[in-house]
C-alpha cells in the first residue's frame, strides 16, 4: 500500500542508534508517531471531500520538517508555517466551537452536531490530537525516550508551539457567532493562561466575528447557580467587549441531557431548560 511504500523509503532515517541523548522531563514521542500521523492524514482526507486533494506525504514532510534536527526548546511558530499552509481548511461561519478544559464533552458534541467543528475536527488538530513528539538538534532521529515538559523544561517545545500555532489560526479564521465550551467545575471557569484565554480570545477578528457565546458546563447534578455571573466569566466578557465583539453566556446545567437533546431535539423533555 501507499503507506508501506512511504515508510519503506524512510526506515533508515528513523532507526534508533544507541547514543547519548538529552533527557527531558516529559514523556517521549508517541510510539509509531510517523505512521500514526500519516495514517490519520490518509483516513481524514478519505472522509472529508474538501480535503481529498491534499497530499499526505507532503503533509508528513512539512510536519517532520517543523521539528526534526531542531533543538526542541527552540521551536517557533514559523517552523510550522509549511504544515499550517498545507492544512489550510475553512470552517463555515457560525460553526466554530472552541473549548477550554472540557475537551471530551466538546468532542462528543461535534460528533453529534456534525456541522460544528472543534480544532480537533480539522485536519491538523486531528493529526496531532493526544500525540507527543520531539526531535534532537542536528540528528534526523525522533526522540522516543523523552520530550520537553512545558513547565519543567521549556514552553517553546514542538507540541506546545504546534497547538499555539494552529489554535491561533483556528481563531483567526473563525467568523459569525463563535461558541466556546467552558468547564464550570473548575476554580477558574475562564483561565487567562489557557490556550483559549491566551491565544484564541485575542485572535478572534472583530471584523468577521459578531459574537462569542460561552456555554458554561455544570458538573454537579444539583448545581443551579448562574455560573455566567462568575468573576472569571465577567473578565472574559470584558476582554471580548473591549475587542468590539458581543458576548453571550449560557449555563448548561445538565450536560448529559444537553447531549441527549442535541441527538434528539424533538424529545419532549428538551423543551424545558438544560
Amino acid at each position: 500500500s501507499g503507506l508501506n511504500d512511504i515508510f519503506e523509503a524512510q526506515k533508515i532515517e528513523w532507526h534508533e542508534l544507541p547514543r547519548w541523548r538529552q533527557q527531558w522531563s516529559g514523556s517521549g514521542t508517541t510510539s509509531r508517531f510517523p505512521e500514526t500521523v500519516l495514517a490519520r492524514c490518509v483516513k481524514y482526507t478519505e472522509v472529508h471531500p474538501e480535503m481529498r486533494h491534499v497530499d499526505c506525504q507532503s503533509v508528513w514532510d512539512a510536519f517532520k520538517g517543523a521539528f526534526i534536527s531542531k533543538y526542541p526548546c527552540n521551536i517557533t511558530e514559523e517552523d510550522y508555517q509549511p504544515l499550517v499552509k498545507l492544512g489550510t481548511q475553512t470552517v463555515p461561519c457560525n460553526k466554530t466551537l472552541l473549548w477550554s478544559r472540557i475537551k471530551d464533552l466538546a468532542h462528543q458534541f461535534t460528533q453529534v452536531q456534525r456541522d460544528m467543528f472543534t480544532l480537533e475536527d480539522m485536519l491538523l488538530g486531528y493529526l496531532a490530537d493526544d500525540l507527543t513528539w520531539c526531535g534532537e538538534f542536528n540528528t534526523f532521529e525522533i526522540n522516543y525516550q523523552s520530550c520537553p515538559d512545558w513547565r519543567k523544561d521549556c514552553s517553546n517545545n514542538p507540541v506546545s508551539v504546534f497547538w499555539k500555532t494552529v489554535s491561533r489560526r483556528f481563531a483567526e479564521t473563525a467568523c459569525g457567532v463563535v461558541h466556546v465550551m467552558l468547564n464550570g467545575s473548575r476554580s477558574k471557569i475562564f483561565d487567562k493562561n489557557s490556550t483559549f484565554g491566551s491565544v484564541e480570545v485575542h485572535n478572534l477578528q472583530p471584523e468577521k466575528v459578531q459574537a462569542l457565546e460561552a456555554w458554561v458546563i455544570h458538573g454537579g447534578r444539583e448545581d443551579s447557580r448562574d455560573l455566567c455571573q462568575d468573576p472569571t466569566i465577567k473578565e472574559l466578557e470584558s476582554i471580548i467587549s473591549k475587542r468590539n465583539i458581543r458576548f453571550f453566556c449560557k449555563n448548561i446545567y445538565r450536560p448529559d441531557k444537553f447531549l441527549q437533546c442535541v441527538k434528539n431535539p424533538e424529545d419532549s423533555s428538551c423543551l424545558s431548560g438544560i
Partner: antibody, heavy 121, light 108 residues
Framework: QSLEESGGDLVKPGASLTLTCTAS????????ICWIRQAPGKGLEWVAC????????KYYANWAKGRFTVSKTSSTTVTLQMTSLTGADTATYFC???????????????WGPGTLVTVSS | VLTQTPSSVSAAVGGTVTINCQCS????????LAWYQHKPGQPPKLLMY???NLASGVPSRFKGSGSGSQFTLTIGEVQSDDAATYYC??????????FGGGTEVVVR
C-alpha cells in the same frame, strides 16, 4: 530582489520540457515559490508550489499531479519539469514568491516576467 | 471557480471603477482573497491581500472589500496608468489557489 524564468520553447505534443526560475538578490530558503501559467488570451492558473528550507515540501494543482514536477536545484533556482505536453499547456509560465510570514501566506508578492511555452506540431 | 464581472470596463480619468469577484465557495478564513494588476509584457503586481489590505507601495485609491464569497475592488480617481487587466485570487483548502478570469480596465 527579482525572479526570472527561462527554458520556454516551441515543442511538439508529447514532448517534455524543463523551466527554470532564478532568484536575484535573495535565496529561496524559507520562501514558498510557485508556478502559475497563463494561456494566450486566458486568465491565470496555479500549477504548483515548493518550500525548501532543508527538505523539499511540494504540492500541485489537481490537474498537474503526475505530469509536472517542481524541484529546487540550488538555493536560487527552482525548476518545473513538464511531461506529455499537449496544446492545452501552451502558455506563459510565471514563477512567483509568496508573501513571507505565517499570516500572509496565500498571496504572491513578487513575480518573474514569464517564459513562453508553445506546444504545436 | 472565481467569476469576475464585468469582463471589461471603460472609465474616464478621475472616475471610479468597481470590479466584482464571486467565488463558488468561500475562500479560506472568509477573507483570504487578493487582487492583482497585470499589464502586457509585465508580471502581475499584488494590489490587495486579505480582501482589504493594501500591498506595499499601492496608492490608497485602490480599495478592497467583501468577505466569504463576494468581493469588490474599487479604483477611485482613475488615472491613465491604471489601464490593465485586474485579477482576483482566492486561497483555499489544502493551500490551493484559484484566479478569476480577469477584468480589463480601459481608461479614456
Amino acid at each position: 530582489q527579482s525572479l526570472e524564468e527561462s527554458g520556454g520553447d516551441l515543442v511538439k505534443p508529447g514532448a517534455s520540457l524543463t523551466l527554470t526560475c532564478t532568484a536575484s538578490g535573495f535565496s529561496f530558503n524559507n520562501y514558498w515559490i510557485c508556478w502559475i501559467r497563463q494561456a494566450p488570451g486566458k486568465g491565470l492558473e496555479w500549477v504548483a508550489c515548493i518550500y525548501s528550507p532543508s527538505g523539499d515540501i511540494k504540492y500541485y494543482a489537481n490537474w498537474a499531479k503526475g505530469r509536472f514536477t517542481v524541484s529546487k536545484t540550488s538555493s536560487t533556482t527552482v525548476t518545473l519539469q513538464m511531461t506529455s505536453l499537449t496544446g492545452a499547456d501552451t502558455a506563459t509560465y510565471f514563477c512567483a514568491r509568496e508573501l513571507s510570514g505565517s499570516s500572509y501566506e496565500g498571496y504572491f508578492e513578487s513575480w518573474g516576467p514569464g517564459t513562453l511555452v508553445t506546444v504545436s506540431s | 471557480v472565481l467569476t469576475q464581472t464585468p469582463s471589461s470596463v471603460s472609465a474616464a480619468v478621475g472616475g471610479t471603477v468597481t470590479i466584482n469577484c464571486q467565488c463558488s465557495q468561500s475562500v479560506y478564513g472568509h477573507n483570504w482573497l487578493a487582487w492583482y494588476q497585470h499589464k502586457p509584457g509585465q508580471p502581475p503586481k499584488l494590489l490587495m491581500y486579505r480582501a482589504s489590505n493594501l500591498a506595499s507601495g499601492v496608492p490608497s485609491r485602490f480599495k478592497g472589500s467583501g468577505s466569504g464569497s463576494q468581493f469588490t475592488l474599487t479604483i477611485g480617481e482613475v488615472q491613465s496608468d491604471d489601464a490593465a487587466t485586474y485579477y482576483c485570487q482566492g486561497y483555499y483548502n489544502g493551500g490551493s489557489y484559484a484566479f478569476g478570469g480577469g477584468t480589463e480596465v480601459v481608461v479614456r
